[in-house]
């Protein structure tokens, strides 16, 4: 039961995270005009990964896409790439994890296949979350650098003659959405990886290792296995535990390969 819950929760958390990554990528408020210490203007500027917008006090909003590809800063291109890779990996991870869910029966899919799929989707979610966090962090770093560069006494303009106080930009809502979403996707991925360990079926476990004792032979087995004395029926690599039906919690208690040295 705990495995199903962990896997299900991991899936839901990742789903929310990826939805957030998509939302953040599409949002226009990656950077917003810094209003602190600025002359009060009747226009508010904000920028996204794909376009920049201006909202006038009158309520009229005008957005212009970045129609050039080569003219854009390399950092912006890198952030775009990271976010898209994050979305693609996350989407594939979601697709894989749907089939990996323990509560969903697909033909005669073995538990080992589900475990592998769960692990794969978990890794994909982790990488997806890291991509989003990296993308947002790179953009935030870019903003911080530009913020301190564009001080109030710096002027820009056509031919250097137009006195335009350079607009300073600060963190927009999309950055926070991206960080939270990336974190959720990462957490969801970790949960999927944890669930994978519990999903690993009995067939994948190592067999009991026999040790020759000085007196009579005893097959040593870690907790969870039935002890068996002598080699009689157990010398032909047969399973020594009962192969009958078990609850998910019982399956979890079986040793993994890491229990053996």
């Amino acid at each position: 039961m705990a495995v199903t819950a962990c896997q299900g929760l991991g899936f839901v958390v990742s789903l929310i995270g990826i939805a957030g990554i998509i939302a953040a990528t599409c949002m226009d408020q990656w950077s917003t005009q810094d209003l602190y210490n600025n002359p009060v203007t009747a226009v508010f500027n904000y920028q996204g990964l794909w376009r920049s917008c201006v909202r006038e006090s009158s309520g009229f909003t005008e957005c212009r896409g970045y129609f050039t590809l080569l003219g854009l800063p390399a950092m912006l291109q890198a952030v775009r790439a990271l976010m898209i890779v994050g979305i693609v990996l996350g989407a594939i991870g979601l697709l894989v994890s749907i089939f990996a869910l323990k509560c969903i029966r697909i033909g005669s899919m073995e538990d080992s296949a589900k475990a592998n799929m769960t692990l794969t989707s978990g890794i994909m979610f982790i990488v997806s979350g890291l991509c989003a966090i990296a993308g947002v962090s790179v953009f935030a770093n870019m903003l911080v650098t530009n913020f301190w560069m564009s001080t109030a006494n710096m002027y820009t303009g056509m031919g250097g003659m137009v006195q335009t106080v350079q607009t300073r930009y600060t963190f927009g809502a999309a950055l926070f959405v991206g960080w939270v979403a990336g974190g959720l996707t990462l957490i969801g991925g970790v949960m999927m990886c944890i669930a994978c360990r519990g999903l690993a079926p009995e067939e994948t476990n190592y067999k009991a290792v026999s040790y020759h004792a000085s007196g009579h032979s005893v097959a040593y087995k870690p907790g969870g296995f039935k002890a068996s004395t002598g080699f009689g029926s157990n010398t032909k690599n047969k399973k020594i535990y009962d192969g009958g039906a078990r609850t998910e919690d019982e399956v979890q208690s079986y040793p993994s390969k890491h229990d053996y040295v």
């Epitope: 009158s58 005008e62 137009v162």
Partner: antibody, heavy 117, light 113 residues
Framework: QVQLKESGPGLVAPSQSLSITCTVS????????VSWVRQPPGKGLEWLGV???????NYQSALRSRLSIRKDTSKSQVFLKLNSVHTDGTATYYC???????????WGQGISVIVSS | DIVMTQSPSSLTVTARERVSMTCKSS????????????LTWYQQKPGQPPKLLIY???TRESGVPDRFTGSGSGTDFTLTISSVQAEDLAIYFC?????????FGSGTKLEIK
């Protein structure tokens, strides 16, 4: 079509309050801002203040302490109140709808107000 | 507050003549976000309320004849009437619509000979 009409007293005594109502039609006060402008006889235009669609207001620096603009969206009315008016308050008061570029694209006919005892 | 300076204060021209008037602001009205200048021109005929002619320094309001052209950027702006008509007799005001408060220029009075 868009229409704005100012109404209020034509005569106000000095040190009293001047209140003018602007009734609008053809647009919603939720979506658009309304500015107030006055023009003393034979002089230029003086911007007084604005109330935006979201209810935010901005005022002329010199009048900020004495001026207030509010609105009743349901009645499509905007109210201007100028406290303790002086004789220099004698002017034609206009209300105007604010559009693109924060420009005033539709104006009322104006109301002439005389400040005199 | 932003100071808007208009010149000349009055102009006397003959019909069909080309005329220009200028407006200078004490600070730039250029917004880098949308590459627009927040400068507006109004026309006020005698006994009438002002009428919007041009916004964003060069965008003509619908219904305004194309003989009216706005130009300029940053702090210096010009309103040009390519061929003055008798009905253009009016006072022309420029206004800052970028910084609060939205200050007006003192106006340029256009008279026809």
């Amino acid at each position: 079509q868009v229409q704005l009409k100012e109404s209020g007293p034509g005569l106000v005594a000095p040190s009293q309050s001047l209140s003018i109502t602007c009734t609008v039609s053809g647009f919603s006060l939720i979506n658009y801002g309304v500015s107030w402008v006055r023009q003393p006889p034979g002089k230029g235009l003086e911007w007084l203040g604005v109330i935006w669609g979201d209810g935010n207001t901005n005022y002329q620096s010199a009048l900020r302490s004495r001026l207030s603009i509010r609105k009743d969206t349901s009645k499509s009315q905007v109210f201007l109140k100028l406290n303790s008016v002086h004789t220099d308050g004698t002017a034609t008061y206009y209300c105007a709808k604010v559009g693109r570029g924060n420009a005033m694209d539709h104006w009322g006919q104006g109301i002439s107000v005389i400040v005199s005892s | 507050d932003i100071v808007m300076t208009q010149s000349p204060s009055s102009l006397t021209v003959t019909a069909r003549e080309r005329v220009s008037m200028t407006c200078k602001s004490s600070q730039s009205l250029f917004n880098s976000g949308n590459q627009r200048n927040y400068l507006t021109w109004y026309q006020q005929k005698p006994g009438q309320p002002p009428k919007l002619l041009i916004y964003w320094s060069s965008t003509r309001e619908s219904g305004v004849p194309d003989r009216f052209t706005g130009s300029g950027s940053g702090t210096d702006f010009t309103l040009t009437i390519s061929s003055v008509q008798a009905e253009d007799l009016a006072i022309y005001f420029c206004q800052n619509n970028y910084y609060y408060p939205f200050t007006f220029g003192s106006g340029t009075k256009l008279e026809i000979k």
